[in-house]
Interface confidence: low
Amino acid sequence: NKILVKQSPMLVAYDNAVNLSCKYSYNLFSREFRASLHKGLDSAVEVCVVYGNYSQQLQVYSKTGFNCDGKLGNESVTFYLQNLYVNQTDIYFCKIEVMYPPPYLDNEKSNGTIIHVKGKHLCPSPLFPGPSKP
């Protein structure tokens, strides 16, 4: 038995930030779960993790350098990514694992969301310009 995940097919990050909502066919209330967001067709980069446990506050972290936050709904987790770079335009997949109560459950691989980062290029501040061009 697998959890189904719905994601927007595409999102555009205009200001180097985006909200990606992962909607699950499963109610996360009073569950111990680990929701994660993965970058790339092979899901090789774990962008952000939201760990939930009914007895603890939500834990949100990235071990791969992304600036992320997470919000929990009954059947969804929303990842808020900031300071994205144009070259981080890619496909992003939601993953969910429920550890408690048994049985362990995870999701069918979703179709993913293409995040197109169109924002400012996070250039140096004009007060500190880079080397001048000839």
Partner: antibody, heavy 127, light 104 residues
Framework: EVQLVESGGGLVKPGGSLRLSCGGS????????MNWVRQAPGKGLEWVGR??????????DYAAPVKGRFTISRDYSKNTLYLQMNSLKTEDTGVYYC??????????????????WGQGTTVTVSS | EIVLTQSPATLSLSPGERATLSCRAS??????LAWYQQKPGQAPRLLIY???NRATGIPARFSGSGSGTDFTLTISSLEPEDFAVYYC??????FGPGTKVDIK
């Protein structure tokens, strides 16, 4: 991004005291189970002790060689972990690392290795 | 107290070769065993947790196996950056003495 940064190392005489600090950022520090691990020069890794997360009672456990001499504590408001080292011996010399398991899962029953480490701070006990 | 023993103490191999490192526990630790890599002057890095699961960002050439008292870390084809010291660790946090993998 998840980060741990240790400070407070230095040179101390046998019998002296030293307090190490470890600042945590990028994760919910209060709930994390935090550890100290040390490494004597040219030797292997040795676990020193750990302190549980706030929601798990915040109690500490220690390795036999340091029990009664070292105390682990934390300041929740400052996201900081401490290692108070008293009655120091020459064999306490080494690099001290602050580590946590931002576990794949949380809690002792879901231990999954220490996947976040600080850069280490050096303690030298010598007369 | 559970004691971990690692063998061999040193493993001399060439890039491209397969490395097999062993860790034995004095009593069962179920699958609660982790493997770390440490390079000179650096903090250890978690490679494998729960005996066989690769940690985030660890290349597929690293694999772990075993349960109970006998565990193995395998590096399928050594890359130049894999020459380092490898430690195993069990849930009550004690570490093995380490295996140094150096260039033949």
């Amino acid at each position: 991004e998840v980060q741990l940064v240790e400070s407070g190392g230095g040179l101390v005489k046998p019998g002296g005291s030293l307090r190490l600090s470890c600042g945590g950022s990028g994760f919910t520090f209060n709930n994390a189970w935090m550890n100290w691990v040390r490494q004597a020069p040219g030797k292997g890794l040795e676990w020193v002790g750990r302190i549980k997360g706030k929601t798990d009672g915040g109690t500490a456990d220690y390795a036999a060689p340091v029990k009664g001499r070292f105390t682990i504590s934390r300041d929740y408001s400052k996201n900081t972990l401490y290692l108070q080292m008293n009655s120091l011996k020459t064999e306490d010399t080494g690099v001290y690392y602050c580590t946590t398991y931002l576990p794949y899962y949380y809690g002792s029953e879901r231990w999954s290795g220490m996947d976040v480490w600080g850069q280490g701070t050096t303690v030298t006990v010598s007369s | 107290e559970i004691v971990l023993t690692q063998s061999p103490a040193t493993l001399s191999l060439s890039p491209g070769e397969r490395a097999t490192l062993s860790c034995r526990a004095s009593q069962s630790v179920s699958s609660y065993l982790a493997w770390y890599q440490q390079k000179p002057g650096q903090a250890p890095r978690l490679l494998i947790y729960d005996a066989s699961n690769r940690a985030t960002g660890i290349p597929a050439r690293f694999s772990g196996s075993g349960s109970g008292t006998d565990f193995t870390l395998t590096i399928s084809s050594l890359e130049p950056e894999d020459f380092a010291v490898y430690y195993c660790q069990q849930r009550s946090n004690t570490f093995g003495p380490g295996t140094k993998v150096d260039i033949k």
